[in-house]
């Protein structure tokens, strides 16, 4: 056979769906990996192929179309299941091809169990939410293209295990559901179920989302440091270990960068001769925001590193800042850092 | 200094509307969601609306829902309560409340009193 | 709705004495609860927040404690200014509801 363009086993797509439910599966090649559609590729004559390995097995197999109700079929570029099995998981290749051109891409599917509580192995996406805002609204994600739109399904939304209703901040409204002045109790995974008709039979769509409240925009700060600060004075004898808190609060801010870092005369960390080590830790409150502390410490210090400038900085996309910390050696009256 | 200063009360007969207004001053209005409480004649207080900043989000305690609406206007630095279809239980103080969900109700107006009654 | 529910309805202590006040919620509300202050004809003040933090110019007798379900608030010396009632106050989940106060009262 001719040489095939091999994409090899797309990861990006680790494509989970739940068991005895309906799933579409769209071939990978025409969103990620080719500059045409399936349209185009289809009228230029391309056939396009699908093929499996089973879980734990090498053996690439055809897919079986020809299954009791159609349970697995092709529609275009779209791989159906109607509905899945927990032994349908494995890795799915489709190849675009004719006599001249091939072209093929495999990615995972993963069939996952659930239970009545909708609890499962499934990642589910994390929607923010900001605290108190006026009206936030969720989606049902993931159910365009299993129905026509003249069906008009049942929906019915759960948080956790309990159906939403007589929720005094959140109100189903079909597809979406709606929260008003959220707050961190509204904090949790949130599952539509949408129910729909084919071919006389009734199949069932399990989406989940975790909400997650996070600080309001408006309470968006520039970093604030909390330690070092002008109170504390680090008074050292040399030989001691001289043990910096570098403490920093970082209000939330969607997709901000939050840095700190030390700076020793000038210098960081890395290009100093001072045998210092740096320890970070960061800790979030219930709204996301962000106590980034890294902890300077040098096991013996000497009477030139007592004279030395310690600077803390922080930054994030409100701004910048810094603070130096008082660093003396004991029974030396001066708190400024000495020039030679 | 954070003031709030509510208007509007009086006396009006069952089934009766009356409209509430809270003017506020020395802090940043529209950054603020608002609520009102109430506190019946020799009673406790209780929660009756809030509403969000930007004025899109808007709650009701059930004893009110449908007959109450919250509203403001950010330009003017007032807060509203439009009270429909008023009952003998809805008499009480009215009081206008600012708060965030990390402080709770930080400041509260002086109130005003609505006495509903033939 | 989340009950709060307070205890005693009225204490009666003297002038120098702690005073001790419960609240106990019927399901948890973390840290997100408040004490208020209210005296006749006035309107309330905020005390407490977040369960332990006072709010802004609340001597320091004040203080609160608890999380979850169960609440205190303590006035470690009382002074005459304290005769007052006392409401807690959850904000964890809407709607927001208040105990139905503790009356303190001179001995």
């Known amino acids: 056979s001719e040489r095939c363009d091999d994409w090899g086993l797309d990861t990006m797509r680790q494509i989970q769906v739940f068991e005895d439910e309906p799933a579409r599966i769209k071939c990978p090649l025409f969103e990620h990996f080719l500059k045409y559609n399936y349209s185009t590729a289809h009228s230029s004559g391309l056939t396009l192929i699908w093929y499996w390995t089973r879980q734990d097995r090498d053996l690439e197999e055809p897919i079986n179309f020809r299954l009791p109700e159609n349970r697995i079929s092709k529609e275009k570029d779209v791989l159906w299941f109607r509905p899945t099995l927990l032994n349908d998981t494995g890795n799915y290749t489709c190849m675009l091809r004719n006599t001249t051109y091939c072209s093929k891409v495999a990615f995972p599917l993963e069939v996952v169990q659930k239970d009545s509580c909708f609890n499962s192995a499934m990642r589910f996406p994390v929607h923010k939410m900001y605290i108190e805002h006026g009206i936030h609204k969720i989606t049902c994600p993931n159910v365009d293209g299993y129905f026509p739109s003249s069906v008009k399904p049942s929906v019915t939304w759960y948080k956790g295990c309990t159906e939403i209703v007589d929720f005094h901040n959140v109100l189903p409204e079909g597809m979406n559901l709606s929260f008003f002045i959220p707050l961190v109790s509204n904090n949790g995974n949130y599952t539509c179920v949408v129910t729909y008709p084919e071919n006389g039979r009734l199949f069932h769509l399990t989406r989940t989302v975790t909400v997650k409240v996070v600080g309001s925009p408006k309470d968006a700060l520039p970093p604030q440091i909390y330690s070092p600060n002008d109170r504390v004075v680090y008074e050292k004898e040399p030989g001691e270990e001289l043990v910096i808190p570098c403490k920093v609060y970082f209000s939330f801010i969607m997709d901000s960068h939050n840095e700190v870092w030390w700076t020793i005369d000038g210098k960081k960390p890395d290009d100093v001769t001072v045998d210092i080590t740096i320890n970070e830790s960061v800790s979030y409150s219930s709204t996301e925001d962000e106590t980034r502390t890294q902890i300077l410490s040098i096991k013996k210090v000497t009477p030139e590193d007592l004279r030395r400038n310690y600077v803390c900085h922080a930054r994030n996309t409100k701004g910048e800042a810094e603070q130096a910390a008082k660093v003396k050696q004991k029974g030396n009256g001066c708190t400024e850092p000495m020039t030679l | 200094e954070v003031q709030l200063l509510e208007s509007g009360g009086g006396l009006v007969q069952p089934g009766g509307s009356l409209r509430l207004s809270c003017a506020a001053s020395g802090f940043t209005f529209p950054d603020y969601p608002l609520g009102w409480v109430r506190q019946a004649p020799g009673k406790g207080l209780e929660w009756v609306s809030a509403i969000s900043y930007d004025g899109e989000g808007t709650l009701y305690a059930d004893s009110v829902k449908g007959r109450f609406t919250i509203s403001r206007d950010n330009s003017k630095n007032t807060l509203y309560l439009q009270m429909n279809s008023l009952r003998a239980e809805d008499t009480a103080v009215y009081y206008c409340a600012r708060f965030r969900y990390y402080t709770a109700f930080d400041y509260w107006g002086q109130g005003t009193l609505v006495t509903v009654s033939s | 709705e989340i009950v709060m529910t307070q205890s005693p309805a009225t204490l009666s202590v003297s002038p120098g004495e702690r005073a001790t006040l419960s609240c106990r919620a019927s399901q948890s509300v973390s840290s997100n609860l408040a004490w208020y202050q209210q005296k006749p004809g006035q309107a309330p003040r905020l005390l407490i927040y977040g369960a332990s933090t006072r709010a802004t110019g609340i001597p320091a007798r004040f203080s609160g404690s608890g999380s979850g379900t169960e609440f205190t608030l303590t006035i470690s010396s009382l002074q005459s200014e304290d005769f007052a009632v006392y409401y807690c106050?959850?904000?964890?989940?809407?709607?927001?509801?208040f105990g139905q106060g503790t009356k303190v009262e001179i001995k």
């Open positions: 106050q959850q904000y964890n989940n809407w709607p927001w509801t």
